[in-house]
């Protein structure tokens, strides 16, 4: 079996995790993609996903998680804003391809969030909370359901999230150089 590798990110509370997961453009550009957490000894839990089919450069915000799929570059950008200590854990980007198991995009991300104000240029406590309006708990399904599920009886509310900030812009020149580089604004 292939050994799963991890990339470690150590951040402070309030900062933003910003990772880019690359995928095979021709195969998966419009496939639904998801961000999952794997707690120690637990099964992967999908926290957020793109639409199906996945839309190009269209931000999807679910709580403090923002997904953007850049079809032209074969990149899924994942941001977790206003990080909390409880967010620490192992994460992965996957491509949904039902009924097969989701296709994992290497590497997994080991996120370690610690308390305290870092006071360094890497710290972005203030900007994070000003830029992103974190919506309250919503009442929609986490992801578009891909079989014939029991439907939710409450319509999802219109999201008030605003993610069309300058931070949403991404200029890609040499894609290989920026895969999984933490971004601290």
């Amino acid at each position: 079996a292939t050994k799963l590798t991890e990339e470690k990110y150590e951040l402070k509370e309030g900062q933003t995790l910003d990772v880019k997961c690359d995928y095979t453009l021709e195969k998966f550009a419009s496939s639904q993609k998801a961000w999952q957490i794997i707690r120690d000894g637990e099964m992967p839990k999908t926290l957020a996903c793109t639409e199906r089919p996945s839309k190009n450069s269209h931000p999807v915000q679910v709580g403090r998680i923002i997904l953007e799929d850049y079809h032209d570059h074969g990149l899924l950008r994942v941001r977790m804003v206003n990080l909390q200590v409880e967010d620490s854990g192992l994460y992965q980007c996957v491509i949904y391809q039902p009924p097969k198991e989701p296709h994992m995009l290497f590497d997994r991300i080991r996120l370690v969030v610690t308390k305290g104000f870092s006071g360094t240029p890497g710290s972005n406590e203030n900007s994070t909370q000003n830029v992103y309006k974190i919506p309250p708990t919503t009442t929609k399904a986490l992801c578009p359901l891909y079989t014939s599920p029991r439907t939710v009886t409450q319509a999802p509310p219109k999201s008030t999230a605003d993610v069309s900030t300058p931070d949403s812009e991404i200029n890609l020149t040499n894609v290989t150089d920026i895969i999984r580089v933490p971004v601290f604004n």
């Epitope: 919503t138 359901l145 079989t147």
Partner: antibody, heavy 119, light 111 residues
Framework: QVQLVQSGAEVKKPGASVKVSCKAS????????MHWVRQAPGQGLEWMGV????????SYAQKFQGRVTMTRDTSTSTVYMELSSLRSEDTAVYYC????????????WGQGTLVTVSS | DIVMTQSPLSLPVTPGEPASISCRSS???????????LDWYLQKPGQSPQLLIY???NRASGVPDRFSGSGSGTDFTLKISRVEAEDVGVYYC????????FGGGTKVEIK
């Protein structure tokens, strides 16, 4: 429609093992996790573990680690839960329940299988 | 493990009247995606449990709208706006924020 049909009641002696089956129908078997939950007579519900029928990976509650094994047969859309080294406290109704990785609750449950452990 | 505490243990109800069950967790059930990983189940006498509410406030398919779930973080409530005779049974809350654990149950019976 979605159905989870479990095997029949079992009577076992202490120290023995029991294997309960749960046959799924009415949906894509490999697209949903299958959980196992047990309930001792007159008691509450207790989560035992979960299997991903797609790849066969499992996660067990710490209490049952080393004693429980969950497997699946995709050709028959069946999952199995085997509990070994049985003791009288394991007398319970065992349920399989369907869940999803994006999480929307355990939306369908089997009818339950009573396992009685008695000498 | 996260400990789930339900109250009351027993709830005598009058048909047509409202009822409320409380569930408290030892840790926050709110995830980074804004969802509370808390479900409510009803186990009617002699039956398997059935899902009522998932992710804190989402009613499962086929569940009457007299059932509603609310709360966030560590404190949650299941409300029945007008109890009907068929609502009797044991109600359980369950968290799936971490390894799933159930509350001890609340037995709802007609007065």
């Amino acid at each position: 429609q979605v159905q989870l049909v479990q095997s029949g009641a079992e009577v076992k002696k202490p120290g023995a093992s029991v294997k309960v089956s749960c046959k799924a129908s009415g949906y894509t078997f490999t697209s949903y996790y299958m959980h196992w939950v047990r309930q001792a007579p007159g008691q509450g519900l207790e989560w035992m573990g979960v299997i991903n029928p797609s790849g066969g990976s499992t996660s067990y509650a710490q209490k049952f680690q080393g004693r429980v094994t969950m497997t699946r047969d995709t050709s028959t859309s069946t999952v199995y839960m085997e509990l070994s080294s049985l003791r009288s406290e394991d007398t319970a109704v065992y349920y399989c329940a369907r869940g999803a990785d994006y999480y929307a609750g355990f939306d369908y449950w089997g009818q339950g299988t009573l396992v009685t452990v008695s000498s | 493990d996260i400990v789930m505490t339900q109250s009351p243990l027993s709830l005598p109800v009058t048909p047509g009247e409202p009822a409320s069950i409380s569930c408290r967790s030892s840790q926050s059930l709110l995830h980074s995606n804004g969802y509370n990983y808390l479900d409510w189940y009803l186990q009617k006498p002699g039956q398997s449990p059935q899902l009522l509410i998932y992710l804190g406030s989402n009613r499962a398919s086929g569940v009457p709208d007299r059932f509603s779930g609310s709360g966030s973080g560590t404190d949650f409530t299941l409300k029945i706006s007008r109890v009907e005779a068929e609502d009797v049974g044991v109600y359980y809350c369950m968290q799936t924020r971490h390894t799933p654990t159930f509350g001890g149950g609340t037995k709802v019976e007609i007065k």
